[in-house]
């Protein structure tokens, strides 16, 4: 159930409506809960979660990552630069979230919910952003060929890719959440 639609909200119509910031915060935490469920299934199925960063680094996925220059960390914090990075990063993650579909057995609905909730989050954030021109949208053709390439990997690499996407997306969202709470 997406944020704002749970039974508690229905049962409390007198409650103050959520502000834009609260809605974004709640949306990110909802997606993080979804990622947690997916990671649980992945980690129960394989030992990928115990892999060290060094082993993971061998996989050459170009997943979005926060860096100091993006203005989202405590040092060098820059609201506008950071917001652009968050939106751009989420847009870049969309192809990887598409890859995750059909990668789960017992959590298939959860994978779909993470994907759909991310689309909603992007919309929320785009409303908040002043400098939409600075946001680059990934090229659909490049995304399509990347998806084909990922799906053609062997089973072990597909498991590793799934684990890496979930871990990186969780990390990216948590960095985003911390930064958005400063705005």
């Amino acid at each position: 159930v997406p944020p704002g639609e749970d039974s508690k909200d229905v049962a409390a119509p007198h409650r103050q409506p959520l502000t834009s910031s609260e809605r974004i915060d709640k949306q990110i935490r909802y997606i993080l809960d979804g990622i947690s469920a997916l990671r649980k299934e992945t980690c129960n199925k394989s030992n990928m979660c115990e892999s060290s960063k060094e082993a993971l680094a061998e996989n050459n996925l170009n997943l979005p990552k926060m860096a100091e220059k993006d203005g989202c960390f405590q040092s060098g914090f820059n609201e506008e630069t950071c917001l652009v990075k968050i939106i751009t990063g989420l847009l870049e993650f969309e192809v990887y979230l598409e890859y995750l579909q059909n990668r789960f057995e017992s959590s298939e609905e959860q994978a779909r919910a993470v994907q759909m909730s991310t689309k909603v989050l992007i919309q929320f954030l785009q409303k908040k952003a002043k400098n939409l021109d600075a946001i680059t949208t990934p090229d659909p053709t490049t995304n399509a060929s990347l998806l084909t390439k990922l799906q053609a990997q062997n089973q072990w690499l597909q498991d590793m890719t799934t684990h890496l996407i979930l871990r990186s997306f969780k990390e990216f969202l948590q960095s985003s959440l911390r930064a958005l709470r400063q705005m």
Epitope: E22, A67, Q74
Partner: antibody, heavy 123, light 107 residues
Amino acid sequence: QVQLVESGGGLVQPGGSLRLSCAASGFTFSNYYMTWVRQAPGKGLEWVSSIYSFSGDTAYADSVKGRFTISRDNAKNTLYLQMNSLKSEDTAVYYCTRNLGGVVVTTNGYDYWGQGTQVTVSS
Amino acid sequence: DIQMTQSPSSLPTSLGDSVTITCQASQSISDELSWYQQKPGQTPKLLIYGASKLQTGVPSRFSGSGSGTSFTLTISGLEAEDLATYYCLQGYSWPFMFGQGTKVELK
């Protein structure tokens, strides 16, 4: 079982430096946020600094910003706190803590604490 | 920065009593609040995270409630081993901040 063992504390003069280490075992270190918390003699707990899993994102209390640097070596399962320009008010027991998290929980909270290492800044 | 105001600083009580400690945040912190217990000469211990979630192994007489700016830790039926200092911590946004602490002691 989870273990956090701090070392590197001691007596240092004002303006001096110390490097604290925290050796972690019993869990996949790289999956967790780690935090330093300190407690001055007879006083309450004070959050000092946190470092996140893979992003390199760090955060500091205003009282130590620009003087302390938190870092981690995931290959060595070790957390560090480099403390420069030490002041007498930095005198405290420094605890290394593990943040709830890893695979499931996203909420803040420190579920494991080391025994602490004493740092005394005095001339 | 978000300030945390914990009260009371000292709480004289009797065994078997119900004890309530409050923590007030200077702005909304959602449910990003945890509670810790520290006994003299010991390291702190996590009791509650996410404002109301009981940490594994913590007795059920401990409970947490609240959201936004106002939070409460309740000990229902104080036992001798509960005599300690309790701290709240906001983990919503940096710099994270502990409350000043509440010492629960016998009258």
